[in-house]
Amino acid sequence: MAKAAAIGIDLGTTYSCVGVFQHGKVEIIANDQGNRTTPSYVAFTDTERLIGDAAKNQVALNPQNTVFDAKRLIGRKFGDPVVQSDMKHWPFQVINDGDKPKVQVSYKGETKAFYPEEISSMVLTKMKEIAEAYLGYPVTNAVITVPAYFNDSQRQATKDAGVIAGLNVLRIINEPTAAAIAYGLDRTGKGERNVLIFDLGGGTFDVSILTIDDGIFEVKATAGDTHLGGEDFDNRLVNHFVEEFKRKHKKDISQNKRAVRRLRTACERAKRTLSSSTQASLEIDSLFEGIDFYTSITRARFEELCSDLFRSTLEPVEKALRDAKLDKAQIHDLVLVGGSTRIPKVQKLLQDFFNGRDLNKSINPDEAVAYGAAVQAAILMGDKSENVQDLLLLDVAPLSLGLETAGGVMTALIKRNSTIPTKQTQIFTTYSDNQPGVLIQVYEGERAMTKDNNLLGRFELSGIPPAPRGVPQIEVTFDIDANGILNVTATDKSTGKANKITITNDKGRLSKEEIERMVQEAEKYKAEDEVQRERVSAKNALESYAFNMKSAVEDEGLKGKISEADKKKVLDKCQEVISWLDANTLAEKDEFEHKRKELEQVCNPIISGLYQGAGGPGPGGFGAQGPKGGSGSGPTIEEVD
């Protein structure tokens, strides 16, 4: 039997994550709820102990006996000012036992007190069990990560927690080091490199500067804010909506713990949505005194609510650079870690600070630390596989690579099995009038709709000058080099403004087995995919044509060339179609096509009449062939035929 694998555990303040290196790649392991991160929560009830999602899910009902933030206590003395300050904010009780803090809870009808190591060991046990369920055999060896600033006492206490959990802790490694390992920054072979790790998690913010030389990691500086993270952004949203509820319903929900907890959960979900969409909806039934709270928030408003918090992330960056005696130009690599680094504004602030430098973000930021810990665990277990020593080199693209166009359609630029290196360019355009930006979402897979494919990364190209839909020309280039590293660049041809993303192979991507499965599935689903693709295409063709016609007859240049009666006829029919579309987004292909033909029957004779004898062809873009592909509420991009 093959040697049992060692696991890598990111033991986080609010969430934890476990990974394993096997079959030549890192697998981040999902828990029994299908989540790849697990809340670092332990709850005690009258009947049982709950860990992870189950614990977090009942926190509103049982706040005094639901313990989280053990990482803020571990290895610290009770009298530590950090402990004394944090205690004020926790709903559970912390007691003093010989200057060691203990958490006191009611469990199965009795009062119990647990050391932070014990609470952390329970979370580690959960992570161990998650790995065992996946691997199918007992796991004992593990690498556990800690913040770079953890002192020896905190490190030792974390190791003890591992031992209590029945783990053989191979090594305690720094979280930023793990993230750097995840990106293979120790294997670039380019001499000494300065790496800045920007780790914005659920409850903490850590900036670390490492120097990597010949596989040796040295922490040059750390900075941060132990009380800045996703939860603070949630709080801003909660406060915003509490005020909105007051305005709308003249009621204050802030003292109702259950209502606030439900609102917080919805806010957290909305916050996540706003990282990929420009708008998010909240729908909470019977939030307070039977009142349903249905509302929404835009990304811009969210950014405004959190602007000071987002901007404050740059202060520790500057401090770390000062402490490391480095100029920002001397940083070779920027690595994003922690779920909150998905927030586009946070990324933009950091990227702008470093004058547009690319960010290493191709690995899921929630998972980068566990990913690196898993690689380190494999190395410490003596895994000699080439992949652990070096990245896989690809000679073909195993899956088609493309981007999402209007309607959630997968528009492939690089087809499956294209030999690499390869480079493909295509022109796209905007979906709405005066659209200020486009969201480029990069996917791999063979399915017609992006929701059925694998999201590799996304970025926004903003600053598009106001123009009617369909006018701007966005040149998108997919460029894969010999190492399988994909660079996607989007350029607004009118301004030359560009943005890009780099996606490295084999990181958060799919395994050979998954690729094979996806290809087989794609065959199976081909027919229904085609129906869906055609349906969306027909919808977009109709929508595009209707808007084009509307703007054509409203064009000031046509004054006097078109009768008011004809203009009204076109506008009335366009209005009919656009309204019908809004109400029938899920109509069948035949219905969309029928409406388009109806609209064309009205518009074509009128429009063509305008151009007869004008010595030129009809107006460009008025054909029936509309865009191929829009789903989300973010800025949408459309394919140009």
Epitope: D572, Q575, E576, I578, S579, W580, D582, A583, N584, A587, D590, E591, H594, K595, K597, E598, E600, Q601, N604, P605, A624
Partner: antibody, heavy 116, light 112 residues
Amino acid sequence: EVQLVESGGGLVKPGGSLRLSCKASGYTFTNYGMNWVRQAPGKGLKWVGWINTYTGEPTYADDFKGRFTFSRDDSKNTLYLQMNSLKTEDTAVYFCARYDHAMDYWGQGTSVTVSS
Amino acid sequence: EIVLTQSPDSLAVSLGERATINCKSSQSLLNSGTRKNYLAWYQQKAGQSPKLLIYWTSTRESGVPDRFSGSGSGTDFTLTIDSLQAEDVAVYYCKQSYTLYTFGGGTKVEIK
């Protein structure tokens, strides 16, 4: 004056084919869509489909996809309905109808009988 | 596919009396942007082609006597013949054009 005149109906055996015509006059042919509607003996009206006379693109009701084909010759202001693999249940009077906000002008209809 | 159900199948009304025909749609025919319901009424006399009476629920086609009126919204529609004349004996059909086109089954109107 708007006029629509159908022709081409008659008796045909099951499995046979027939082409119906609808000649339009009194208006600009390509400005209005043209529909085909049929009525089986003693039954109600059933929409067969329509053709965009400007682009020539047809739309067929679900029951008529496959065996029926619409076309038009705008130089002759004429619409055609090609019916293949005819069945006894295709026996009906076939009308062409112009479409503006609704089917505002109708032909007199042409009778098709499918029988062995 | 939208299904239109007409009722009654037939009705006999005395000359000069009011005739009311109903048409129920399986889904709403109201376009909220144009505020129009896409329902039309046709009259077909024996041995003749159908004739358009009313479109957009209540707009009379030119030349149609004003004793014919249409009403309704959403899914429920009515054609009313205010004072039935002998020449109104016919089969009446409703037809939707909200999405594709479908006819109702028809209502036969006779003199009592």
